[in-house]
């Protein structure tokens, strides 16, 4: 069963974060999510990765999707699973790794012109309706525009970063664009290898905050350059 997966992977026996809760005891505000917390644990590598229960794809990382780990699709707990690489079977876009999408049940590379056009078309359409999609997983459940009284806050629909409050940028999330937090030191960032590759991302990240730049994490040793992790680091 899924719970045996959770238990065998010792999800409840992780070493405690050095600083206690993410926001540190006594503070109601948690630290910004990211690769490192001040005084906290380092980001887990694949070797000691713990199953992460989820209800929606949006809760998982950029390289994951949410599903039952059992083939039959146990109606119980779902966890974040590693995304499917090119030519692997899929049932929806979120299952495919960044730079790919699900076409005819197979993860295929996002053809820049075709796929970007498809996304932008959908974004334009969504802004023409009373029921815009608010974020990635809202494609299944649309919310009325009354929801946007918190305009410019995290999760609000936007067209450009100037629509968002301070500390947020306007970034793509599936078929819409929403205000997301500008990245802080230690958070994972996206280093674009070629001009215009931003258009391929279904889950676009914000840029690094002031005084930070997106660079390869020094202690992140991996076989290939292409899979190295980039994080926001001080200039």
């Amino acid at each position: 069963t899924l719970n045996s997966v959770l238990n065998s992977n010792a999800i409840k026996n992780l070493p405690p974060p050095l600083g206690g809760a993410a926001g540190h005891p006594g503070s109601a505000v948690s630290a910004a999510p990211g690769i490192l917390y001040p005084g906290g644990n380092k980001y887990q590598t694949i070797d000691n990765y713990q199953p992460y229960p989820c209800a929606e794809d949006e809760e998982c990382g950029t390289d994951e999707y949410c599903a039952s780990p059992t083939r039959g699709g146990d109606a119980g707990v779902q966890i974040c699973l590693a995304c499917r690489k090119r030519r692997k079977r899929c049932m929806r876009h979120a299952m495919c790794c960044p730079g790919n999408y699900c076409k005819n049940g197979i993860c295929v590379s996002s053809d820049q012109n075709h796929f970007r056009g498809e996304i932008e078309e959908t974004i334009t359409e969504s802004f023409g309706n009373d029921h815009s999609t608010l974020d990635g997983y809202s494609r299944r459940t649309t919310l009325s525009s009354k929801m946007y009284h918190t305009k410019g806050q995290e999760g609000s629909v936007c067209l450009r970063s100037s629509d968002c409050a301070s500390g947020l940028c306007c970034a793509r999330h599936f078929w819409s664009k929403i205000c997301k937090p500008v990245l802080k030191e230690g958070q994972v960032c996206t280093k674009h290898r070629r001009k215009g590759s931003h258009g391929l991302e279904i889950f676009q990240r914000c840029y690094c905050g002031e005084g930070l730049s997106c660079r390869i994490q020094k202690d992140h040793h991996q076989a290939s350059n292409s899979s190295r992790l980039h994080t926001c680091q001080r200039h």
Partner: nanobody
Framework: KVQLVESGGGLVQPGGSLRLSCAAS????????LKWVRQAPGKGLEWVSH????????MYADSVKGRFTISRDNAKNMLYLQMNSLKPEDTAVYFC?????????????????RGQGTQVTVSS
Amino acid sequence: KVQLVESGGGLVQPGGSLRLSCAASGFPFSIYPLKWVRQAPGKGLEWVSHISRDGGRTMYADSVKGRFTISRDNAKNMLYLQMNSLKPEDTAVYFCARSAGKVVSRASLENDYRGQGTQVTVSS
């Protein structure tokens, strides 16, 4: 800023009940699934329960299934955990949490947004 404030913890005898509450602010509450996690003394974070954004789907760890009930009130930006038939092994600091989502490559409980926690002690 994402803010999560838990309350309702306390000292209770085995077999007793408690209702934890979590007041959320700083983000559009109704579009996020939410969860409760706990941390027993000297242990790591343990996932307890999960609720979908509309409250229609809930999930529980085996250790609390049938005893705990998670719920939410989107109009009030509140998350709840009703804990019945409490056992000494339920003693922990309980946190309400929200996923960090797509800003990390791989999700982990440590990367979640969470509050300061509320202490639950089950002892006779």
